[in-house]
């Protein structure tokens, strides 16, 4: 094939090599950019900045090499449009620093920075950590800071991410209240800070106030939906990012729902309870307190992380006719109490009883197709049945 006379020439099916001296000063309008997976750039002294717009449209890029060029600055968001980038070689350029933000969100298997006049500062603490942790092939490069010695020896005691303290109200918060949160940010070189409120949706009206180092957030007219929702304060400096999440507990009274008993491997009387603080529960059977045992007990399902409602079962292992009756679930917290009742009929007396035995009263049956080895349930359709033993 004839030699390629252009600044950049195809290399393989999806690669591009740009090696003609001084031909590029930016990466705009590279040919076939959309499908490129590999871009190799060398000897481009005029290529000094790499910014967000330069790599727009290179969404498939996996390997980027810019070596022996004049690169002085890589923008923190330079690789926003190249999320699949896995190998980045920026060796033998004029880079003094590289922000932690530049590589955040990438899954870099390899990062090569040797041959740059790096300046040891807290801004390279993230790179020092990569070296310590053996990431991206960094340890093998034995990176040096220009005139300062090895990067590994850089003092880092003062290189910390911001420290955040979020103040939440001590007092109980009720539905309809306004809540003021304050986020105090401490640390060196603070750059940005803010609130993440994505979980809040309709839980409150939000008003932000203040700025670094003290951010305010008012949650007005809060609802009970605010419970279990994260309110997150974040801040960044040249070392990295810190986040602290808090939750506001909004008090509201207990509520309870009961559902018809269902037969699974065992029997279950399903329930849902809600309230903040979480209500205490108590079962009654035919009006008397039900003592829980390994045959009859409360079983909770795994709670959802972002809501206060709890679902569960009153679980009955092999219930018999003596377990037929009225089940009541009482739920109470300091803000109110609630109850719900349901009739459950598991079966008629499965044991052949004598005429002098007491007459058991059976309540309306639970219509179910039993596949267990337990006694057959009643199938009559009458709402109440009285079983009478005839002598």
């Amino acid at each position: 094939a004839a030699p390629c006379p252009d600044a950049c020439c195809p290399h393989g099916s999806s690669g591009l090599r740009c090696t003609r001296d001084g031909a590029l000063d930016s990466l705009h309008h590279l040919p076939g950019a959309e499908n490129l997976t590999e871009l190799y750039i060398e000897n481009q002294q005029h290529l000094q900045h790499l910014e967000l717009r330069d790599l727009r449209g290179l969404g498939e890029l996996r390997n980027l090499t810019i070596v022996k060029s004049g690169l002085r600055f890589v923008a923190p968001d330079a690789f926003h449009f190249t999320p699949r980038l896995s190998r980045l070689n920026l060796s033998f350029n004029a880079l003094e620093s590289l922000s932690w933000k530049t590589v955040q969100g990438l899954s870099l298997q390899e990062l090569v920075l040797s041959g740059n006049p790096l300046h040891c500062s807290c801004a390279l603490r993230w790179l020092q950590r990569w070296e310590e942790e053996g990431l991206g092939g960094v340890p093998e490069q034995k990176l040096q800071c220009h005139g300062q010695g090895p990067l590994a020896h850089m003092p880092n005691a003062s290189c910390g991410v911001p420290t955040l303290k979020v103040q939440v109200p001590n007092a109980s918060v009720d539905v309809g209240d306004d809540v003021l949160l304050r986020c105090q940010v401490e640390g060196r070189g603070l750059e940005q800070a803010g609130w993440i409120l994505t979980e809040l949706e309709q839980s409150a009206t939000v008003m932000k106030s203040g700025g670094l180092p003290s951010l305010g957030l008012t949650l007005a007219n809060v609802t009970s939906d605010l419970n279990r929702k994260n309110v997150t304060c974040w801040a960044e400096n040249d070392v990295g990012r810190a986040e602290v999440s808090v939750q506001v507990n909004v008090s509201f009274p207990a509520s309870v729902q009961l559902h018809t008993a269902v037969e699974m491997h065992h029997w279950c009387i399903p329930f849902s309870v809600d309230g903040q603080p979480a209500p205490s529960l108590r079962w009654l059977f035919n009006g008397s307190v039900l003592n829980e045992t390994s045959f009859i007990f409360t079983e909770f399902l795994e709670p959802a992380a972002n809501e206060t409602v709890r679902h569960g079962c009153l679980r009955l292992n092999q219930p018999t006719h003596v377990n037929n009756g009225n089940y009541t679930l009482l739920a109470a917290n300091p803000f109110g109490q609630a109850s719900a009742s349901i009739m459950a009929a598991f079966m008629d007396n499965p044991f052949e009883f004598n005429p002098e035995d007491p007459i058991p009263v059976s309540f309306s049956p639970v219509d179910t197709n039993s596949t267990s080895g337990d006694p057959v349930e009643k199938k009559d359709e009458t709402p109440f049945g009285v079983s009478v033993a005839v002598g």
């Epitope: 003592n291 829980e292 045992t293 390994s294 045959f295 009859i296 007990f297 409360t298 079983e299 679980r315 292992n317 092999q318 018999t320 006719h321 003596v322 499965p350 044991f351 009883f353 035995d357 267990s372 080895g373 337990d374 006694p375």
Partner: antibody, heavy 111, light 108 residues
Framework: QVQLQESGPGLVKPSGTLSLTCAVS?????????WTWVRQPPGKGLEWIGE???????NYNPSLKSRVTISVDKSKNQFSLKLSSVTAADTAVYYC????????WGQGTLV | SSELTQDPAVSVALGQTVRITCQGD??????ASWYQQKPGQAPVLVIH???NRPSGIPDRFSGSSSGNTASLTITGAQAEDEADYYC???????????FGGGTKLTVL
């Protein structure tokens, strides 16, 4: 499958406290099962001591209730028995088991 | 009263059928479970509920209940069935568990 293993001293002085632990392996003690202790004096029958659920509910044999404590340690996936003020009449093989049907048993430990 | 009564000993000829019984007031209300225990070993559950057999238990073992009596039947007893058999159930209150005194089965 779930396995149970009792451990603890084989000898306790009269008036002392018997302490045994049952390690649960092959499953979580926080499952929908209760856990129980049963004992069997030499040459005699089985006696239920008590049961516990991982949320803290517990029931004891009325004849032993004043002397028995059963507890659960979820972090170690085990449950324990303490029997105070023991006498020679408490000499027995002590078993832990899975309730309510006692479908899994430890091998037992003689105290 | 909250107790379960078993015959202390029962014998059966090899290959014949034997019924081991358990009596108690609580059996009018609750199912019994049955356990087999061989010398020096922990008990093994053989029947629970109306007639539920755990996996690995031969189908010659079956359970039934009538009035205040629960029964364990072994149809075609084998030599390896020689053991002590215990019933248990909830007591009349439903709050505690109780065991029968045990039945020693001898296979002749």
């Amino acid at each position: 499958q779930v396995q149970l293993q009792e451990s603890g001293p084989g000898l306790v002085k009269p008036s002392g406290t018997l302490s045994l632990t049952c390690a649960v392996s092959g499953g979580s003690i926080s499952s929908s099962n209760w856990w129980t202790w049963v004992r069997q004096p030499p040459g005699k029958g089985l006696e239920w001591i008590g049961e516990i659920y991982h949320r803290g509910n517990r029931n004891y044999n009325p004849s032993l209730k004043s002397r028995v404590t059963i507890s659960v340690d979820k972090s170690k996936n085990q449950f324990s028995l303490k029997l105070s003020s023991v006498t020679a009449a408490d000499t027995a093989v002590y078993y832990c088991a899975r309730a309510p049907f006692f479908d899994r048993w430890g091998q037992g430990t003689l105290v | 009263s909250s107790e379960l009564t078993q015959d202390p000993a029962v014998s059966v000829a090899l290959g014949q059928t034997v019924r081991i019984t358990c009596q108690g007031d609580s059996l009018r209300s609750y199912y019994a479970s049955w356990y087999q225990q061989k010398p020096g070993q922990a008990p093994v559950l053989v029947i629970h509920g109306k007639n539920n057999r755990p996996s690995g238990i031969p189908d010659r073992f079956s359970g039934s209940s009538s009035g205040n009596t629960a029964s364990l039947t072994i149809t075609g007893a084998q030599a390896e069935d020689e053991a002590d058999y215990y019933c248990n159930s909830q007591d009349s209150s439903g709050n505690h568990l109780i065991f029968g005194g045990g039945t020693k089965l001898t296979v002749l």
